[in-house]
Amino acid sequence: LDLSNVQSKCGSKDNIKHVPGGGSVQIVYK
């Protein structure tokens, strides 16, 4: 299970991976 593009809704932005667009996002960052 590849979770490399998962973005936390409540965690630090430090963990955000730079993906090439919204199509690669799994959770909308709040």
């Epitope: 090439p20 667009g21 919204g22 996002v25 799994q26």
Partner: antibody, heavy 120, light 112 residues
């Protein structure tokens, strides 16, 4: 308030390079992507590429690959776009824009634009 | 590459009347996980930098008048202006950010 301030107009010779700067203020520079977009005279908008300052990771428009380099200096909150092997068709206004990365992926703040003229 | 096509390319309008711009993408811009369409609309007024109007296909940016409405999903999108005002003249661009970024050709809106 959020501001993106770009460097001044440039006149360049064909075959040379240009480096345009974009100084950000009013937000945490590392939290947003900076995109570069150009507009030739009387033409539409063309996305060139982007950088995520936190990691230095970049994506480029295939059209410009090998000719464009986008960098960022976190210590000064400044992004740079360098375009090499300039030709007359590169005459355009070059914009930097803050891209709301991770949510809308929309460019919510734009610089004032930098006119680059390529002429012999 | 995702190709964005706008129509019409030129739109003469009468103040107070509605206006509509179409934008079509060569592939779907809907992310089924986030349930968002990664489509934005921008207005570039004469002599100015572009400004964001709509993102996620239908969410109005803060400060944008409610006469601007974005709609659509997948590959077909529309920007509607309910009652055009003189200050709305300029070039309107749609832009996809599903994969990298691509702008439409632009639609020039001018007063008749």
């Amino acid at each position: 308030q959020v501001q993106l301030v770009q460097s001044g107009a440039e006149v360049k010779k064909p075959g040379s390079s240009v480096k345009v700067s974009c100084k950000a203020s009013g937000y945490t520079f590392s939290d947003y992507v900076i995109s570069w977009v150009r507009q030739a005279p009387g033409q539409g908008l063309e996305w060139m590429g982007e950088i995520f300052p936190r990691s230095g990771s970049t994506y480029y428009n295939e059209k410009f690959k090998g000719r464009v380099t986008i960098t960022a200096d976190k210590s000064t909150s400044t992004a740079y776009m360098e375009l090499s092997s300039l030709r007359s068709e590169d005459t355009a206004v070059y914009y930097c824009a803050r891209d709301y990365y991770g949510t809308s992926f929309a460019m919510d703040y734009w610089g004032q634009g930098t006119l680059v003229t390529v002429s012999s | 590459d995702i190709v964005m096509s706008q129509s019409p390319l030129s739109l003469p309008v009468t103040p107070g009347e509605p206006a509509s711009i179409s934008c079509k993408s060569s592939q779907s811009l809907l992310n089924s996980r986030t349930r968002k369409n990664y489509l934005a609309w921008y207005l570039q007024k004469p002599g100015q930098s572009p400004q964001l109007l709509i993102y996620w296909a239908s969410t109005r940016e803060s400060g944008v008048p409610d006469r601007f409405t974005g709609s659509g999903s997948g590959t077909d999108f529309t920007l509607k202006i309910s009652r055009v005002e003189a200050e709305d003249v300029g070039v309107y661009y749609c832009k996809q950010s599903f994969y990298l970024r691509t702008f439409g050709q632009g639609t020039k809106v001018e007063i008749k």
